[in-house]
């Protein structure tokens, strides 16, 4: 089978600070040295890119400076963290993995992680 399997948790609850973390693991059919990981958000059949990073195996993921994502890699496993989430960002987040080099190219699409974000209640004014 030439398909690449990507596994990710079904559900994750973001912290009260709007931070959600999950692991994206892929079963590499080949010995990739350069990998691109993309987080996609799917809502109402519309898919948008949240963030993307390319890394050399053994090195750290490098997201753009203004990215809301950070991450670390270990073998065929990527630990992803998305920050600054609000309740309106609740949705399905798909992990996409591409083995860019060496040939052949492989594409792997996870089933998605449903991230639930609950905005914190505002602190009540306290009179002393």
């Amino acid at each position: 089978c030439k398909a690449m399997h990507v596994a990710q948790p079904a559900v994750v609850l973001a912290s009260s600070r709007g931070i959600a973390s999950f692991v994206c693991e892929y079963a590499s059919p080949g010995k990739a040295t350069e990998v691109r990981v993309t987080v996609l958000r799917q809502a109402d059949s519309q898919v948008t890119e949240v963030c993307a990073a390319t890394y050399m195996m053994g090195n750290e993921l490098t997201f753009l400076d203004d990215s809301i994502c950070t991450g670390t890699s270990s073998g065929n496993q990527v630990n992803l963290t998305i920050q600054g989430l609000r309740a309106m960002d609740t949705g399905l987040y798909i992990c996409k993995v591409e083995l860019m080099y060496p040939p052949p190219y492989y594409l792997g699409i996870g089933n998605g992680t449903q991230i639930y974000v609950i905005d914190p209640e505002p602190c009540p004014d306290s009179d002393f």
Partner: antibody, heavy 118, light 108 residues
Framework: EVQLVESGGGLVKPGGSLRLSCAAS????????MHWVRQAPGKGLEWVSF????????YYADSVKGRFTISRDNAKNSLYLQMNSLRAEDTAVYYC???????????WGQGTMVTVSS | EIVLTQSPGTLSVSPGERATLSCRAS???????LAWYQQKPGQAPRLLIY???SRATGIPDRFSGSGSGTDFTLTISRLEPEDFAVYYC?????????FGQGTKVEIK
């Protein structure tokens, strides 16, 4: 409007060269992989070449390897295909196509005809 | 290279009838990586189905995809006049990207 527009096709003699262009508009070009696909008259679709987001990685069909070169200019939202040592069997309509975020070719240009004949 | 074989080569169907197109892969293709395209004469292909069964934006629900592993199917539940065209399956999970040879759906 989200679209791809190819240009540069025409009639060329065997052994000649041609450069195809594909102008992208209406989307963030650098966020997508791009492909060239061709279709010989009365035949099916044949994938020709792929280029990664930043242009660092390129793949080719065996039938064009060593003769065709794919490139992109993200600043100009443009994709190119340099075709050298052309043969009669390269005669086809050439389409540029966008590799969608989930992988399939979700946006196609209208195509440009390349005829290789003496 | 994954070889995709479509059958039948030509399908003659009357408007309003159901059309079933088959695509068989030479080796297993993950269902996330199988697409169907429609092409009309003089036009570029148009994405219909991706991930074996998800309809692309704007595609009517009379088009549906199914299958897994090596066998995939495109079904058009009730053929409309504008559906008579050539249909191609494609795998996009690994290079080289490959297409089936196409199935022509013609008016009976």
């Amino acid at each position: 409007e989200v679209q791809l527009v190819e240009s540069g096709g025409g009639l060329v003699k065997p052994g000649g060269s041609l450069r195809l262009s594909c102008a992208a508009s209406g989307f963030t070009f650098s966020s997508y992989t791009m492909h060239w696909v061709r279709q010989a008259p009365g035949k099916g679709l044949e994938w020709v070449s792929f280029i990664s987001y930043d242009g660092n990685y390129k793949y080719y069909a065996d039938s064009v390897k060593g003769r065709f070169t794919i490139s992109r200019d993200n600043a100009k939202n443009s994709l190119y295909l340099q075709m050298n040592s052309l043969r009669a069997e390269d005669t086809a309509v050439y389409y540029c196509a966008r590799g969608g975020l989930l992988g399939p070719f979700d946006l196609w240009g209208q195509g440009t005809m390349v005829t290789v004949s003496s | 290279e994954i070889v995709l074989t479509q059958s039948p080569g030509t399908l003659s169907v009357s408007p309003g009838e159901r059309a079933t197109l088959s695509c068989r892969a030479s080796q297993s293709v993950g269902s996330s990586y199988l697409a169907w395209y429609q092409q009309k004469p003089g036009q570029a292909p148009r994405l219909l189905i991706y991930g074996a069964f998800s309809r692309a934006t704007g595609i009517p629900d009379r088009f549906s995809g199914s299958g897994s592993g090596t066998d995939f199917t495109l079904t058009i539940s009730r053929l409309e006049p504008e559906d008579f065209a050539v249909y191609y399956c494609q795998q996009y999970g690994s290079s080289p990207w490959t297409f089936g040879q196409g199935t022509k759906v013609e008016i009976k």
